[in-house]
């Protein structure tokens, strides 16, 4: 549901973020220190443009642990 060129909006976006980020939580605006470009916010990026898994993961609150 979040391949290249897909858009995610509304509750579908919220639910997808909850799934991707799991218990890490998420931000709707990426903290500036973690943004490698001017962050538009995830609604802007995923709903008005398109997003993929990699982009979604940048909005998770803490980095995923590498096992």
């Amino acid at each position: 549901a979040y391949g290249p060129g897909e858009t995610l909006c509304g509750g579908e976006l919220v639910d997808t973020l909850q799934f991707v980020c799991s218990d890490r939580g998420f931000y709707f605006s990426r903290p500036s220190s973690r943004a490698n470009r001017r962050s538009r916010g995830i609604v802007e990026e995923c709903c008005f443009r398109s997003c993929d898994l990699a982009l979604l993961e940048t909005y998770c609150a803490t980095p995923a642990k590498s096992e």
Partner: antibody, heavy 120, light 107 residues
Framework: QVQLVQSGAEVKKPGASVKVSCKAS????????MHWVRQAPGQGLEWMGI????????SYAQKFQGRVTMTRDTSTSTVYMELSRLRSDDTAVYYC?????????????WGQGTTVTVSS | DIQMTQSPSSLSASVGDRVTITCRAS??????LNWYQQKPGRAPDLLIN???SLQSGVPSRFSGSGSGTDFTLTISSLQPEDFATYFC?????????FGGGTKVEIK
């Protein structure tokens, strides 16, 4: 208090365009997305599209794609909805409505509505 | 597009009655369902969002429930000011869509 005030009623001929304004006050204009919804006489509600007042990005319902344009003026905290190539079935009350949060929780503040009548 | 089907389209009830309105989505929308009240000549007012979250200032006689595809708006004891039309709306995905409305009339 938080308020959305829309422009007055319009009467247009088929084929013409109409531009409805919606002026926001009482909150930070650029912090909330704005929807446009219309209601034909005696009918239900129909979502037309949304604009991000901060960056100006838009998303339109497919039905209106190519005929609707939503814009904003941050200096006056106003959003606009222009509908072109009007037909008689575009006769409706047009509402702007503020999004609650993240496009996920509905519309909590509505304008008073603008009646657009399309008649030859 | 997600279709929203409301029932009944109209109902007659008396002051004090318990009223139930249902809304069904054509696919799962989780809990992203909102309810609005509209009185003649007025804009809609948001009553409930996220299926069951009552908006500030809305009387506690209103309640919402459901998730997935089936949702309910209940008015526990109908008051004179509650005679209006009620709409459900999904905010799960674009385009956002509304139910056809339920008109609550005086019996």
């Amino acid at each position: 208090q938080v308020q959305l005030v829309q422009s007055g009623a319009e009467v247009k001929k088929p084929g013409a365009s109409v531009k409805v304004s919606c002026k926001a006050s009482g909150y930070t204009f650029t912090s909330y997305y704005m929807h446009w919804v219309r209601q034909a006489p005696g009918q239900g509600l129909e979502w037309m599209g949304i604009i991000n007042p901060s960056g100006g990005s838009t998303s339109y319902a497919q039905k209106f794609q190519g005929r609707v344009t939503m814009t904003r003026d941050t200096s006056t905290s106003t959003v606009y909805m222009e509908l072109s190539r009007l037909r008689s079935d575009d006769t409706a009350v047009y509402y702007c409505a503020r999004d609650v949060q993240w496009l996920a929780y509905g519309m909590d503040v509505w304008g008073q509505g603008t009646t657009v009548t399309v008649s030859s | 597009d997600i279709q929203m089907t409301q029932s009944p389209s109209s109902l007659s009830a008396s002051v004090g009655d318990r009223v139930t309105i249902t809304c069904r989505a054509s696919q799962s929308i989780s809990s992203y369902l909102n309810w609005y009240q509209q009185k003649p000549g007025r804009a809609p007012d948001l009553l409930i969002n996220a299926a069951s979250s009552l908006q500030s200032g809305v009387p506690s006689r209103f309640s919402g429930s459901g998730s997935g595809t089936d949702f309910t708006l209940t008015i526990s004891s109908l008051q004179p000011e509650d005679f209006a039309t009620y709409f459900c709306q999904q905010s799960y995905s674009l385009p956002f869509t509304f139910g056809g409305g339920t008109k609550v009339e005086i019996k």
